[in-house]
Interface confidence: medium
């Protein structure tokens, strides 16, 4: 691994033991104090987007060896690491193999490629909720929910790059209906699978179903931003949308570059660089704090391309929250 | 966001110094801050950290003879046993990068008789 | 105790060239290497973190590479605001150490 830490047993290479080198030795990590916050770091360190996990390491086959050390008693990161080695940590004293540390990050390997063309979310707000439909031999076709699983979901949401499946298991409302022709029922989707057309099925348009059995799949919300508490779209208090879930920026970092960015993506022109005072004039938001630390190039067409601390993480209050006014 | 280093000065060899380091728009509970110092023409040289949960930790060269500690706001480095060889300037700097590495101008220490 | 031995101690090249600096560590080390450019009178800046990771602002001409015990500083294209001292640095266990550095001329 070119950087001394790496994810051992887990389905890619984003899950798994934590395991680390020291002096050419690779060994293992004890769980004491691990948290979300060490793999948030972990997970930055590797290229693997955020964390989603601190599963026990010894749920990875194969176990690490008898032989192999337990190189840290514990890591203490506060989250704004970027690698392992920046964080805290305690020799080893008192551990064993059965308390190694596990991790499992989002891998956004599989969620950064292009929209595939061989399946769509039909119907839906968005291209990551809606029915279920496939394409073959130039043909898009429907899925029936016979045999559908959150495991098949999964598979949809990761090959649309739309993060994890939050519902499965509906039924389309009337007006959601497919008038394509039924694909296939019987999906036998383990999960790891890269398309939905890798998962194993019963015969292609072989199968009893109705259009009211046709599937409904709504994966986690892309993100999106927005700016609230203004007299237009675009001017207010900025808000994105992250798991669903509306929250606010801190201004810790924020700038210029950050502004325009902002008024870029909504498609409202120019930053109009307001002074502090005129930025305050929306009030402090309520509920979650999602992004601190963002710092934008100016060249990116959207604020989730900009680096940025964990989602989540801060050390601010609603008095930081970030506002914009752009040239509409 | 900035770092501020103050409290250099000329002092004779054996006296105790401390220098402060000011940090602003960001909290030190969620950082670890390094102290790293240049002798004049020479290279940087870390002298050791402090971590997020108040954990100190040193270069080997330092024998005891600096200690860190912090408050709220401030990173304090205090100094004994000086001799002219700690002539230097000396820096406070926030330990991550992604999130924006942060350097303060440093502050000027001469140690002379 | 990790060592970072850095090469050249200096260089000098005329503009428009590349200028190569190499970082290697007494054992291997995370990552978590950067590399640093510092003027007279001013507090080193970043340029790459994360060995090969370039900072918001930095130009592309910077370009860090390099795993285990061997890191590489590439400047293409030399301008002569480039001419200044580089260091290496790595984030160790509870650590951190510096490379001597590497004085870069412009001729």
């Known amino acids: 691994s070119p950087s001394g830490v790496r994810l051992v047993g887990g389905l890619h290479r984003c899950e798994g033991r934590v395991e680390v080198e020291q002096k050419g030795q690779w060994g293992t990590v004890c769980d004491d104090g691990w948290d979300i916050k060490d793999v948030a770091v972990l997970c930055r360190e590797l290229g693997c987007g955020a964390a989603s996990g601190t599963p026990s390491g010894i749920l990875y086959e194969p176990p690490a060896e008898k032989e192999q050390k337990v190189l840290i008693q514990s890591v203490s990161c506060t989250g704004t690491e970027d690698t392992l080695a920046q964080c805290e940590q305690e020799e080893v004293y008192d551990c064993s193999h059965d308390e190694d540390a596990g991790a499992s990050c989002e891998n956004p390997e599989s969620s950064f490629s292009p929209v595939p063309e061989g399946v769509r979310l039909a119907d839906g707000p968005g291209h990551c909720k809606g029915r279920v439909e496939v394409k073959h031999q130039n043909q898009w076709y429907t899925v029936c929910q016979t045999g559908w699983s959150l495991r098949a979901a999964k598979v949809v949401c990761r090959q649309l790059g739309c993060g994890r499946a939050v519902l499965t298991q509906k039924r389309c409302n009337k007006h959601a209906y497919g008038r394509k022709p039924i694909w296939l029922s019987q999906m036998s989707c383990s999960g790891r699978e890269a398309t939905l057309q890798d998962c194993p099925s019963g015969p292609w348009g072989k199968n009893t179903c109705n259009h009211d059995e046709d599937t409904w799949v709504e994966c986690e919300d892309p993100f999106d931003l927005r700016l609230v508490g203004g007299d237009n779209l675009c001017s207010g208090r900025l808000e994105v949308l992250h798991k669903g879930v509306w929250g606010s920026v801190c201004d810790d970092n924020w700038g210029e570059k950050e502004d325009q960015v902002v008024c870029k993506q909504l498609g409202c022109g120019k930053s109009l660089s307001p002074s502090f005072r005129d930025r305050k004039c929306y009030g402090p938001g309520v509920g979650r704090i999602w992004l601190d630390n963002v710092r934008c190039s100016g060249e990116e067409q959207s604020l989730e391309q900009c680096q940025h601390r964990f989602w989540g993480f801060h050390d601010c209050t609603h008095q930081e929250d970030v506002a914009v006014i752009c040239s509409g | 966001q900035s770092v501020e280093e103050s409290g250099g000065r000329l002092v004779t060899p054996g006296t105790p110094l401390t220098l402060t380091c000011t940090v602003s728009g960001f909290s030190l509970s969620s950082y670890a801050m390094n102290w790293v110092r240049q002798a004049p023409g020479k290279g940087l040289e870390w002298i050791g950290l402090?971590?997020?949960?108040?954990t100190t930790h040193y270069a080997s060269w330092v024998n005891g003879r600096f200690t860190i500690s912090k408050t709220s706001t401030t990173v304090t480095l205090k100094m004994t046993s000086l001799t002219a060889a700690d002539t230097a300037t000396y820096f406070c700097?926030?330990?991550?990068?992604?999130?924006?590495?942060?350097w303060g101008q440093g502050t000027l220490v001469t140690i002379s008789s | 105790e990790l060592v970072l031995t850095q090469t050249p101690a200096s260089v000098s090249e005329p503009v428009g060239g590349t200028v190569t600096i190499k970082c290697q560590a007494s054992?291997?080390?995370?990552?978590?290497l950067v590399w640093y450019q510092q003027k007279p009178g001013q507090p080193p800046k970043l340029l790459i973190y994360?060995?090969?990771n370039l900072e918001s602002g930095v130009p592309s001409r910077f370009k860090g590479s390099g795993s285990g015990t061997e890191y590489t500083l590439t400047i293409s294209g030399v301008q002569c605001a480039d001419a200044a001292t580089y260091y290496c640095?790595?984030?160790?266990?509870?650590?951190?150490?510096f490379g001597g550095g590497t004085e870069v001329e412009i001729k």
């Open positions: 402090i971590y997020a949960s108040g």
């Open positions: 640095q790595c984030s160790g266990y509870n650590s951190r150490v």
């Open positions: 054992q291997s080390i995370y990552s978590s």
């Open positions: 700097a926030r330990d991550s990068y992604s999130t924006g590495n942060l």
């Open positions: 994360g060995a090969s």
